[in-house]
Interface confidence: low
């Protein structure tokens, strides 16, 4: 079973998928459609890198531009370096400016 066939089978269960499952899927050439991506848990999407989202969506990555003001895309963009977002060539704006320090807030919260 190839990545696309596997994706069709598990598509209906993806809404609550954790980050690790999404990272694994991104390695399987599944080309997740935007409608499915938009239903994912925001907290599961946030840790994904630009490269992982690009692999996860495949040819559908271009649709991020249309959804840049909506969750979870909006929140995900805010967590990415602008430099990395620029590599997609989609004109996505709102990432962390170059030279800014990125703090791991989840670690900070765990310690407080």
């Amino acid at each position: 079973m190839n990545g696309s066939e596997y994706f069709v089978k598990i598509q209906s269960f993806l809404g609550g998928a954790p980050t690790e499952d999404l990272k694994a899927l991104s390695q399987q050439n599944v080309s997740m459609d935007l409608a499915t991506f938009m239903k994912l848990r925001t907290d599961a999407v946030l840790p994904l890198t630009v490269a992982e989202v690009q692999k996860l969506l495949g040819p559908h990555v271009e649709g991020l531009k249309a959804e840049e003001r909506h969750r979870p895309v909006r929140d995900w963009i805010l967590r990415q370096r602008q430099d990395d977002l620029d590599t997609l060539g989609l004109g996505l704006q709102g990432g962390i400016p170059n030279g800014y320090l990125v703090l791991d807030l989840s670690m900070q919260e765990a310690l407080s």
Epitope: D33, L34, A35, P59, H60, V61, E62, G63, K65, A66, E68, R69, T87, L88, G89, L90, G91
Partner: antibody, heavy 120, light 107 residues
Amino acid sequence: QVQLQQPGTELVKPGASVKLSCKASGYTFTSYWMHWVKQRPGQGLEWIGNVNPSNGGSNYNEKFKNKATLTVDKSSSTADMQLNSLTSEDSAVYYCAPHYIGSRPGFAYWGQGTLVTVSG
Amino acid sequence: DIVMTQSQKFMSTSVGDRVSVTCKASQNVGTNIAWYQQKPGQSPKALIYSASYRYSGVPDRFTGSGSGTDFTLTITNVQSEDLAEYFCQQYNSYPLTFGGGTKVEIK
């Protein structure tokens, strides 16, 4: 059936502006980006930019940023491109071409094109 | 910007023959490539997307192949109506860019 109506020709004077229209039918207008492509006589194709009819967001080829302005009128399912400060270099056929917002932009449909002639 | 190079501006072939039009990208574009056919006085017509998938209604004598930087459009059993100019286009990143075109002439 997807249809894209463009005027056949526009004759304009150097230094003037022109607004080209592309009236779409046969699909959900707000679900498709509208792209614009330039072709000078006997030459290749150049991508000018695209506009998202659902929110007016746009992307431009840097080369055309000060030349073209892309807008849409959702009520009439029409995309417009205004070209300003026209010179002979702008004499070309201009095509509109939509593509579905959730996929990468290969152009399955093209308008017939508008021939713009800049002549004094 | 990604530069798409179609090194052959003209290609001559005969009806029934096979012809291959090539296109080279200046950087890796995966399979984010489309091919178009344009006949004199007409709009471009989409033939191939994602490097190798035919649009519906396109005859199966048109085949696309390649990935990364090197791509080929092959026409087998060339017909007289295939007389046209062929363009490749990358849609891996903005700005979208096209090759300069290859004119296929029938002997």
